[in-house]
Amino acid sequence: DAGVIQSPRHEVTEMGQEVTLRCKPISGHNSLFWYRQTMMRGLELLIYFNNNVPIDDSGMPEDRFSAKMPNASFSTLKIQPSEPRDSAVYFCASSL
């Protein structure tokens, strides 16, 4: 069984451009989480969904960030406009 699948693996963009990250959770998992990790700030929970419904998006108070989960097998995290300080590793995770 495949694990959580994210794309793209790497993204380089100019400041001000829109960035869209995609995630496919493990089949049968009903919770999905987006995290951000940097050296300076550590691991931050951005948002999590349960049964496709956003439960807590308090980790992304800037309205440049938006996340959607249109169905049980797909989620996106969008940054518009992007800023240099958004440079980080973004993780998607899922759980039962």
């Epitope: 550590g42 691991l43 929970l45 951005l46 807590d56 308090s58 108070p61 309205d63 440049r64 800023e83």
Partner: antibody, heavy 117, light 106 residues
Framework: EVQLVESGGGLVQPGGSLRLSCAAS????????MHWVRQAPGKGLEWVSY????????LYADTLKGRFTISRDNSKNTLYLQMNSLRAEDTAVYYC??????????WGQGTTVTVSS | DNQLTQSPSFLSASVGDRVTITCRAS?????AYWYQQKPGKAPKLLIY???NLAPGVPSRFSGSGSGNEYTLTISSLQPEDFATYYC?????????FGQGTKLEIK
């Protein structure tokens, strides 16, 4: 009914410290981001700090970094603002506010901080 | 940091008037948010995501705009609308407010 009640304000000397509290009720505090905002006498609103539900995301106004520390205790439904090295210009009414509708949808009544010798 | 400039800073108007307050951002923002504050009271959210009315806010209030310029309009002023109004942005931290617009009775 959403309620936010600030406390801990008072008169403090320059260089002193104060810890403000904000007791929350009527909503799921442990899933909600919270802000501190202040208003100096006769002046406009100034955003101070933000903390996410689990405290992993914390933001400050640039001018206050290093002196002010935001924190929360979800088991007590309480938000805090620790203020150190206080200056006369920190004199203000301090409000806590709930993050909602992408903004600040509920506010407390405020607590007054006066920094004076 | 972004700067929000409201105009006018002071506005005298009469009951029944239509008034518009403008909020200009030094850098483009995704949305504007508007608050009303009366003397000695906490601010109250009026408009979120540029044009959405907060619960309980009368329909005479409306918001519009995009990019660097946003407006709050009151279609027919009522006595209880005389207050100070603030815009705010959440596109990028720090979450600055405009300096405020004081709406007074003419």
């Amino acid at each position: 009914e959403v309620q936010l009640v600030e406390s801990g304000g008072g008169l403090v000397q320059p260089g002193g410290s104060l810890r403000l509290s904000c007791a929350a009720s009527g909503f799921t505090f442990s899933r909600t981001g919270m802000h501190w905002v202040r208003q100096a006498p006769g002046k406009g609103l100034e955003w101070v700090s933000y903390i996410s539900s689990g405290s992993s995301t914390i933001l400050y106004a640039d001018t206050l970094k290093g002196r002010f520390t935001i924190s929360r205790d979800n088991s007590k439904n309480t938000l805090y603002l620790q203020m150190n090295s206080l200056r006369a210009e920190d004199t203000a009414v301090y409000y806590c506010a709930r993050r909602g509708e992408g903004a600040m949808d509920y506010w407390g009544q405020g607590t007054t901080v006066t920094v004076s010798s | 940091d972004n700067q929000l400039t409201q105009s006018p800073s002071f506005l005298s108007a009469s009951v029944g008037d239509r008034v518009t307050i403008t909020c200009r951002a030094s850098k483009s923002v995704n949305y504007a948010y508007w608050y009303q504050q009366k003397p000695g009271k906490a601010p109250k959210l009026l408009i979120y995501y540029t044009s959405n009315l907060a619960p309980g806010v009368p329909s005479r209030f409306s918001g519009s705009g995009s990019g660097n310029e946003y407006t709050l309009t009151i279609s027919s002023l009522q006595p209880e609308d005389f207050a100070t109004y603030y815009c705010q942005q959440f596109t990028s931290s720090p979450f600055v407010f405009g300096q405020g617009t004081k709406l007074e009775i003419k």
